[in-house]
């Protein structure tokens, strides 16, 4: 049969509220060298126990009896501390455990989860969470909106999750947890009602350097909209903004619109350029969420200036004309150049030169036409840019370089057939 237990004092019981500090104590009397006392909780050795061991000899000799006291300190009682506690010693080849003591938790309900502050769009459903536990159980919850209970009694209304179908004004929510020991009230969560996201952002009109956009405002509850904010960002090719991407790749151009009307003219844009735009509307409570980025594009415009550095020289019945691309913005893709030349008493001759920046003209009448002048204009798909000032044909002087060019015969008739999609701004000398 087993040896008699060396334990002369067993752990007591502790029951209290969270945060309580308490001590469990066991005492044993042993002969010879005192053993190390281990503590068990629910059969598991406590490896990081806050325990102290005191050993008092009862005689002069080491082999006499010793009183050993082990104290386990529980510093701030938590649910994880609850259970059955025992002391454990190894004496010789035998194992002894004390009688158990129990640690229990009992007090006001303790919140595991409380409602959090949040923003919601007006008239939009959302959920709030609240969770509390004892012991003692059961714990019944009572939700309050703006300090008004949402049920007749605790446990009768929604419990862990409160579904709110929508709000039209900023409101406060809290929850009360009730058990046999009393009531605990959660923090008060403020639910701020923001305007709904605007809808149907669309283009009303387009100009090369401006876009007119409009949108439909969302509901904003009892709070009128104060303004809407529109952002435009260049669509960086290859880095295009995805429809729902939250942040643009660069600093956006931001404009504010007074409302109503829910419309805005965005100016100072680059022509023939892709942009992404989005809009958010603001009330006294704050801004709505942004709409998704909408891809838009400014149309092409005509070149804003004439070709530069035009030179025209004449050698007998031939004229050599060359120029450089306009310095002014092209406002689109350069499709080519138009050239017009005219003598003093002759009709104007119009030519489409294409993208070349020089041409050799074969003049009629063996160069006898006097006071010949040349004008050049650049064009895009949107039409012609302004014509250059008339440049007189200078007589060619020996020593001047004159490259060999394909000769362009003057058309037999002065009329010129324009491609149907070009708009020709007629030029008069």
């Amino acid at each position: 049969q087993a040896e008699e237990s060396p334990f002369v004092g067993n752990p007591g019981n502790i029951t209290g509220a969270r945060g309580l500090t308490g001590t469990l104590r066991c005492q044993l009397q042993v002969q010879g060298e005192p053993p190390e006392v281990h503590w068990l909780r629910d059969g598991q050795i406590l490896e990081l126990a806050d325990s102290t061991q005191t050993q008092v000899p009862l005689g002069e000799d080491e082999q006499d009896d010793w009183i050993v006291v082990s104290q386990l300190r529980i510093t701030s009682l938590q649910l994880s501390d609850t259970g059955q506690y025992q002391c454990l010693v190894f004496l010789g080849h035998q194992t002894f455990v004390s009688q158990p003591g129990y640690v229990g938790l009992e007090g006001l309900p303790y919140f595991l989860e409380e409602p959090e502050d949040r923003t919601v769009a007006a008239n939009t459903p959302f959920n709030l969470s609240c969770q509390a536990q004892g012991p003692p159980e059961p714990v019944d919850l009572l939700w309050l909106q703006d300090a008004v209970p949402l049920a007749t009694a605790p446990g009768h209304g929604p419990q862990r999750s409160l579904h709110v179908p929508g709000l039209n004004k900023t409101s406060s929510f809290s929850c009360e947890a009730h058990n046999a020991k009393g009531v605990t009230t959660s923090r008060t969560a403020t639910i701020t009602v923001l305007p709904q996201q605007p809808r149907n952002l669309h283009l009303v009109s387009r100009q090369p350097t401006e876009l007119e956009v409009a949108w439909t405002p969302g509901l904003s509850g009892i709070y009128p909209l104060t303004h809407c904010t529109l952002q435009a960002v260049l669509s960086d090719d290859g880095m295009g903004i995805q429809a729902g991407e939250p942040d643009p790749p660069e600093e956006p151009l931001t404009s504010q619109a007074s409302v109503p009307p829910h419309q805005l003219r965005l100016g100072s844009l680059h022509p023939h350029t892709p942009y992404h735009i989005r809009v958010a509307c603001t009330s006294s409570q704050g801004p709505s969420s942004w709409t998704h980025w909408l891809p838009v594009e400014t149309p092409e415009g005509v070149p804003l200036g004439p070709p530069e550095n035009i030179s025209a020289t004449r050698n007998g019945s031939q004229a050599f004309v060359h120029w450089q691309e306009p310095r002014a913005p092209l406002q689109g893709t350069l499709l080519g150049y138009r050239l017009a030349y005219q003598g003093q008493d002759t009709p104007e001759v119009l030519m489409d030169i294409g993208l070349r920046q020089e041409v050799t003209l074969e003049l009629q009448g063996d160069g006898s036409v006097s006071n010949l002048t040349v004008c050049v204009a650049a064009y895009t798909a949107a039409g012609d840019g302004p014509w250059s000032l008339p440049v007189p044909l200078e007589a060619w002087r020996p020593g001047q370089a004159q490259p060999v060019h394909q000769l362009v015969k003057e058309p037999s008739t002065p009329a010129f057939s324009w491609p149907h999609h070009h708009h020709h701004h007629h030029h008069h000398h």
């Epitope: 087993a2 629910d42 598991q44 025992q86 454990l88």
Partner: antibody, heavy 116, light 106 residues
Framework: QVQLVQSGAEVKKPGASVKVSCKAS????????INWVKQAPGQGLEWIGW????????KYNEKFKGRVTLTVDTSISTAYMELSRLRSDDTAVYYC?????????WGQGTLVTVSS | EIVLTQSPDFQSVTPKEKVTITCSAS?????MYWYQQKPDQSPKLLIY???NLASGVPSRFSGSGSGTDYTLTINSLEAEDAATYYC?????????FGQGTKLEIK
């Protein structure tokens, strides 16, 4: 000396229940936890749960919760493990073991075979 | 749960050799326990609280380690040591065992 003696082998059909016993001697039965451990053929060891005979308190491995019930009869220093809704993968040797934060004494094991 | 991984799974050793079995825990633990199981027998406690020899266990067995890495050492192996060895933790619930190391004597 400490001894744990288990009941004999059992053959059961799928869906049935089995109850294995473990008789303790040589120590104060109500002071020490009794654990149950499963060992499937050619496999390792898997803890099922414990019971504290002094109070009847139990703790189960989540994997076995709902199908296993641990009980004791302190008057005859015997612990029991009942396993219900038996399946073919319940075929194993089941051990009872005394624990003091680890398993210091083991029963000889009971083979439970589940076969149709 | 804490997973214990033993190394090696199998070892064939000659008598008088020194054998080392390691056990690695998936997270830090305070104590390790070691068991020996011979064919058709129940497991037997060898080492408790990492380094303490259980009653009746020969002194050629020893245990050491801390944190996540623990070792069982058998100095001068004997024929009767042919068995499967298991490590075990109970630092957190549920208690778990290693997959076992089978030791064969050449």
């Amino acid at each position: 000396q400490v001894q744990l003696v288990q009941s004999g082998a059992e053959v059961k059909k799928p869906g049935a229940s089995v109850k294995v016993s473990c008789k303790a001697s040589g120590y104060p039965f109500t002071d020490f936890y009794i654990n149950w451990v499963k060992q499937a053929p050619g496999q390792g060891l898997e803890w099922i749960g414990w019971i504290y005979p002094g109070s009847g308190n139990t703790k189960y491995n989540e994997k076995f919760k709902g199908r296993v019930t641990l009980t004791v009869d302190t008057s005859i220093s015997t612990a029991y493990m009942e396993l219900s809704r038996l399946r073919s993968d319940d075929t194993a040797v089941y051990y009872c073991a005394r624990s003091t934060g680890f398993f210091d004494y083991w029963g000889q094991g009971t083979l439970v075979t589940v076969s149709s | 749960e804490i997973v214990l991984t033993q190394s090696p799974d199998f070892q064939s050793v000659t008598p008088k050799e020194k054998v080392t079995i390691t056990c690695s825990a998936s997270s830090s633990i305070g104590y390790m326990y070691w068991y020996q199981q011979k064919p058709d027998q129940s497991p037997k406690l060898l080492i408790y609280l990492t380094s303490n020899l259980a009653s009746g266990v020969p002194s050629r067995f020893s245990g050491s380690g801390s944190g996540t890495d623990y070792t069982l050492t058998i100095n001068s192996l004997e024929a009767e040591d042919a068995a499967t060895y298991y490590c075990q933790q109970w630092s957190s619930n549920p208690p778990t065992f290693g997959q076992g190391t089978k030791l064969e004597i050449k």
